[in-house]
Interface confidence: low
Amino acid sequence: ENIDDCASAACFHGATCHDRVASFYCECPHGRTGLLCHLNDACISNPCNEGSNCDTNPVNGKAICTCPSGYTGPACSQDVDECSLGANPCEHAGKCINTLGSFECQCLQGYTGPRCEIDVNECVSNPCQNDATCLDQIGEFQCICMPGYEGVHCEVNTDECASSPCLHNGRCLDKINEFQCECPTGFTGHLCQYDVDECASTPCKNGAKCLDGPNTYTCVCTEGYTGTHCEVDIDECDPDPCHYGSCKDGVATFTCLCRPGYTGHHCETNINECSSQPCRHGGTCQDRDNAYLCFCLKGTTGPNCEI
């Protein structure tokens, strides 16, 4: 037979008694605690700092505060200084700054994250220009420039004309990683360093000698030729040098083709057909053009008085 333990129980302050096997349980009204509801519940007055959990000690009714991270003390009202707990919570030599209930890290250049645990990739922002290669380093970046560029960000196009490389008043054109010289007439080469040999193309004809000069050349003609390039054969038949004949032009010479009865370089000499004494038997010879005439003595006749 079950004995009603509540009959002899002493639940305080109007608490409700519940009988159990060989025991009882006092159900306390609001604000009371303890086995017999005989103690005031200390948590009623909210003694624990906001954000803490309050539990009542069932023996003495006092409040037990369970503190959230960053707080300590009986009422969880004291801030924990995380920066003074030994090891620096901020990595990579970040500076620890205590805050209420927590801490902050001031990171060195090149690091980020709540605890400075992340190495910033300085190349993410593409700081290197003109197709340069970006090398991420701790707290910095380095640009490896393409040829023809310089500067921290490879932003400067190297002025290859700065050293005035073009000679002989050549005009320098700055290009990417190179320069180009526009040479004045008569000069050539990457730097306009060469005087153009105008004789290289053998402009002088007919065996003439070529004399190279600055931006010009002179042809010294061989005998019988004339013109800038000695390309003109001089006409030695003009004016006609042949007196009694026709002229044939040659190289630096001429030939007279004499009419019959004439001879000499210029056909200037009339051939004396009487010089061979063609008239016989005392006939008299008279010279004619390419002919002769015999005047015969009485008693002789024939072209040469031979009869």
């Epitope: 250049q109 380093q137 380095q142 310089e150 921290v152 990683n177």
Partner: antibody
Framework: EVQLLESGGGLVQPGGSLRLSCAAS????????MSWVRQAPGKGLEWVSS????????YYADSVKGRFTISRDNSKNTLYLQMNSLRAEDTAVYYC????????WGQGTLVTVSS | QSALTQPASVSGSPGQSITISCTGT?????????VSWYQQHPGKAPKLMIY???NRPSGVSNRFSGSKSGNTASLTISGLQAEDEADYYC?????????FGGGTKLTVL
Amino acid sequence: EVQLLESGGGLVQPGGSLRLSCAASGFTFSNYGMSWVRQAPGKGLEWVSSISGYGSNTYYADSVKGRFTISRDNSKNTLYLQMNSLRAEDTAVYYCARISQQAVWGQGTLVTVSS
Amino acid sequence: QSALTQPASVSGSPGQSITISCTGTSSDIGGYQYVSWYQQHPGKAPKLMIYYVSNRPSGVSNRFSGSKSGNTASLTISGLQAEDEADYYCQSADSSSWVFGGGTKLTVL
């Protein structure tokens, strides 16, 4: 005008230490890597060490590795070379130089290692 | 960090032209446009004469010119003058260091 001025040279015994400084002016110091170059009496030029603009990367010749330390203080526009365990063969004029296509050199400071 | 190869000495008469060669590898001269030439008179700091293979700093005579072909760089001095007598050093770069030539002594006869 771009200028580099070395200081800190002098006479030191073998095994001793010396710290060279190089004060820079006339350009944005942190934008440029810097080098130390030395020249022994009657000999040629020898590269010693280099450091990147912010000091993250350092490079050393085999002959000084483990004994010399290059560093820089960009707030003071100054380059340093800490030389430890000095030997007679470290005797030289030490020049600091700016790393760029058109390099700039200082006038040098003489380091003599002798007992 | 091997040194670049230069002739130990060259000489020429006033008015003549001379060329100093500087031979490296594909890791230095052959791999970079970064070639400089320095002139050094006794007791003086090196003076930059040519940078970026063929560029002259302002104030350097146009008698000095530089060029590069493959792994070899060259410095040419035309119209030699007495004051050109000095030591000349070539300089290039590899991936992490500077590389110098052993130096060439120029004598003006």
